[in-house]
Interface confidence: low
């Protein structure tokens, strides 16, 4: 599930990881675009083990997953989590 959560709060990610997370461990991905109170794009991966990881948007693996999800969900608009 590819989701965009627009917020007027500050940045959420205090540190970002580029470590690969296998797709089978991923529950969902959230994208906070640049702006809305944060000067950078943030990608947050919700893992199936109940943890959350902020991912480096430049990491090649997350870009591949996002591209695939974009194609998959192009017909349906993203739904906010909260």
């Amino acid at each position: 599930v590819l989701e965009v959560y627009y917020t007027h709060l500050r940045c959420r990610c205090v540190q970002e990881s580029s470590v690969f997370i296998p797709r089978r461990f991923i529950d969902r991905i959230q994208i906070s675009p640049r702006g809305n109170g944060c000067p950078r794009k943030e990608i947050i991966v919700w893992k199936k083990n109940k943890s959350v990881v902020c991912v480096d948007p430049q990491a090649e693996w997350i870009q591949r997953i996002m591209e695939m999800l974009r194609k998959k969900s192009s017909s349906t608009p993203p739904v906010p989590v909260f």
Epitope: E16, I44, V53
Partner: antibody, heavy 123, light 111 residues
């Protein structure tokens, strides 16, 4: 404001089933990422995590006690329940209800606690 | 299970001085660059209160004299300067692996 309140029988006998209720306000267990759990503390001793339940009905148990534990929820009533079967004197403790995390869904620490309910198992 | 060993079991510190509490895990509690170690304060007759989450993040409303540090297996809670209100028992907790576990506690007293 998040508030949690535990209730229990106070005293029960060995081999009985302990039924605990956590009534909470200030959040809903239907909200994505919310979890409620139980922790106990024998008098003057340390803390032991027992179980927790997530908004999506995912349930986690302490393996050392799993065979005796059942956690459930009544989302519409803002309540979570814990049953401990076949209690023994070692189950005498203060039982705390907790809400888990809430900081951007990382869901891994006990952010809010009830005042606790004291349970004594005695013959 | 991940065993958390706190040291010392108790310590007495003079007002205004620094108190340092250690928590050592039997295996790493880090995951994807995040340390899943948290600290709580418990006063007599009260439930524990969250102080620090993810090793070093200060919970909202907690005074800045509390700080946390560490990674993988070795973590520290520092109280500096110590005040009379800090007399309590402090617990560490890990949530990297089920079952989530707590340290045995460290009792802080005023010298």
């Amino acid at each position: 404001e998040v508030q949690l309140q535990e209730s229990g029988p106070g005293i029960l006998q060995p081999s009985q089933t302990l039924n605990l209720t956590c009534s909470f306000s200030g959040f809903s267990l239907s909200t994505f990422g919310m979890g409620v759990g139980w922790i106990r503390q024998p008098s003057g001793k340390g803390l032991e995590w027992l179980a927790h339940i997530w908004w999506d009905d995912d349930r986690r148990y302490n393996p050392a006690l799993k065979s005796r534990l059942t956690i459930s929820k009544e989302t519409s009533k803002n309540q979570v329940f814990l049953k401990i079967a076949n209690v023994d004197t070692a189950d005498t403790a203060t039982y705390y209800c907790t809400r888990i995390a809430g900081y951007y869904g990382s869901r891994d620490w006990f952010a809010y606690w009830g005042q606790g309910t004291t349970v004594t198992v005695s013959s | 299970d991940i065993v958390l060993t706190q040291s010392p079991a108790s310590l007495a510190v003079s007002l205004g001085q620094r108190a340092t509490i250690s928590c050592r895990a039997s295996e790493s509690v880090d995951n994807s660059g995040i340390s899943f170690m948290h600290w709580y304060q418990q006063k007599p007759g009260q439930p524990p209160k969250l102080l620090i989450f993810r090793a070093s993040d200060l919970e909202s409303g907690i005074p800045a004299r509390f700080s946390g540090s560490g990674s993988r297996t070795d973590f520290t809670l520092t109280v500096n300067p110590v005040e009379t209100d800090d007399v309590a028992t402090y617990f560490c907790q890990q949530s990297n692996k089920d079952p989530w576990t707590f340290g045995g506690g460290t009792k802080l007293e005023i010298k």
